[in-house]
């Protein structure tokens, strides 16, 4: 003969555990039924009664089959350097993440906690390393036969250009001047930019930010404060 | 516990490609920048170059360009450090470390406990 | 690049007195207002370990008898006072642009 379905409540057998979406109540001593995502339990299980479920009030959620008595606070709203990649609803919390030109310098479990502005590369430096979601620009100093005459966090160092007669010869911060109307080649037509990182819900990333309105606060986590830029601008 | 396990010391003929690894473990791998720094026998401390294992970006000291080449492998949270055409100059223990880009400071705040490479004919 | 130069290469101190090393970066290491230089401890056979980070901050574990100042290109190490397990080389570290460049150490022997 099939086994007959329990329906909850009902006493489990010794030594099993309650099904998927169930949970066992210690007081009723019985499995019970588990709330949906979006609501909580208003009333819990007795011996005779089952879960009675109740849908979460407005900036309230719950992610998971839960039996919870409240609905979990939705997270403050974004902040200015910050774009809502998801919003608060009953089923889910709401995620901030820093908009570009802006990077986390502090995360948290989803999304950022705190937003600081991309360092930018003054004239002389190009970036070496981009923006992450997570990590500030790193810059560096251009090599000879390059230069970025810009203060940027996305510009890289751009190659001189060749010219039949050099009028005025280039330096780190400086292209080139040639005297004929046209240089034999340019190479380098036009700034060079790099990608902005895209902001993701992906556990730990980060955006992009400026560096000279980055907060000035030192975080002394496990360990310490946040990022440099190459060359910045406030050197 | 942040963790960066290194390979074993190698010896090497000269002229021949090395190739040492840096397991990492306790943290998310392709968040942080992990640098590659070499110290030959009583000398001083010198910056290879950097990866970024989230998108693969690289950053190297021009003196290594050529000559080492990084890589990292995300599903094994391991980054590697090839380097080639080896010399007696290369010599070296080599040091993996991650880079902290907090708010306001970058700092190596885990190392390695370094691999020994010994270039001998 | 940014050459850094330590100094004295070593120095004998006795215990229970103060060691001051320098660090002097070819130009500045600051950035908004912030120095991204680090110092490094190293002993023999093991690699460096964080000392303090951007000029002056202690990381969690390091005892505050290690303490760092200064901005721009003049930097300091202090130790105060010395103990016998602060016996190791120490290095200074700017990371204010790639590539990252390190002094070339200091020895401190404990007298």
């Known amino acids: 003969l099939p086994a007959q379905v329990a329906f909850t409540p009902y006493a489990p057998e010794p030594g099993s555990t309650c099904r998927l979406r169930e949970y066992y109540d210690q007081t009723a001593q019985m499995c019970c039924s588990k709330c949906s995502p979006g609501q909580h339990a208003k009333v819990f299980c007795t011996k005779t009664s089952d879960t009675v479920c109740d849908s979460c009030e407005d900036s309230t959620y719950t992610q998971l089959w839960n039996w919870v008595p409240e609905c979990l606070s939705c997270g403050s709203r974004c902040s200015s350097d910050q774009v809502e990649t998801q919003a608060c609803t009953r089923e889910q919390n709401r995620i901030c993440t820093c908009r570009p030109g802006w990077y986390c310098a502090l995360s948290k479990q989803e999304g950022c906690r705190l937003c600081a502005p991309l360092r930018k590369c003054r004239p002389g430096f190009g970036v070496a390393r981009p923006g992450t979601e997570t990590s500030d620009v790193v810059c560096k100093p251009c090599a000879p036969g390059t230069f970025s005459n810009t203060t940027s966090s996305t510009d890289i160092c751009r190659p001189h250009q060749i010219c039949n007669v050099v009028a005025i010869p280039g330096n780190a911060s400086m292209d080139a001047v040639c005297t004929s109307t046209s240089p034999t080649r340019s190479m380098a037509p036009g700034a060079v930019h790099l990608p902005q990182p895209v902001s993701t819900r992906s556990q730990h990333t980060q955006p992009t930010p400026e560096p000279s309105t980055a907060p000035s606060t030192s975080f002394l986590l496990p360990m310490g404060p946040s990022p440099p830029a190459e060359g910045s601008t406030g050197d | 516990e942040v963790q960066l396990q290194q390979s074993g010391t190698v010896l090497a003929r000269p002229g021949a490609s090395v190739k040492m690894s840096c397991k990492t473990s306790?943290?998310?791998?392709?968040?942080?920048?992990m640098h590659w720094v070499k110290q030959r026998p009583g000398q001083g401390l010198e910056w290879i170059g950097t990866i970024y294992p989230g998108n693969s970006d690289t950053s190297y000291n021009q003196k290594f360009k050529g000559k080492a080449k990084l890589t990292a492998v995300t599903s094994a949270s391991t980054a590697y450090m090839e380097l080639n055409s080896l010399t007696n100059e290369d010599s070296a223990v080599f040091y993996c470390?991650?880079?902290?880009?907090?708010?306001?400071?970058?700092?190596?705040?885990?190392w390695g406990q370094g691999t020994t490479l010994t270039v001998s004919s | 690049d940014i050459v850094m130069t330590q100094s004295p290469a070593s120095l004998a101190v006795s215990l229970g007195q103060r060691a001051t090393i320098s660090c002097k970066a070819s130009?500045?290491?600051?950035?908004?207002?912030?120095?991204?230089l680090n110092w490094y401890q190293q002993k023999p056979g093991q690699p460096p370990k964080l000392l303090i980070y951007?000029?002056?901050n202690l990381p969690s574990g390091i005892p505050a008898r290690f303490s760092g100042s200064g901005s721009g290109t003049d930097f300091t190490l202090n130790i105060h006072p010395v103990e016998e397990e602060d016996a190791a080389t120490y290095y200074c570290q700017q990371s204010n642009e790639d590539p990252r460049t390190f002094g070339g150490g200091t020895k401190l022997e404990i007298k």
């Open positions: 951007a000029a002056s």
């Open positions: 306790g943290y998310t791998f392709t968040s942080y920048w």
């Open positions: 470390t991650r880079e902290n880009l907090l708010l306001r400071s970058y700092f190596f705040d885990y």
């Open positions: 130009q500045s290491v600051d950035y908004d207002g912030d120095s991204y």
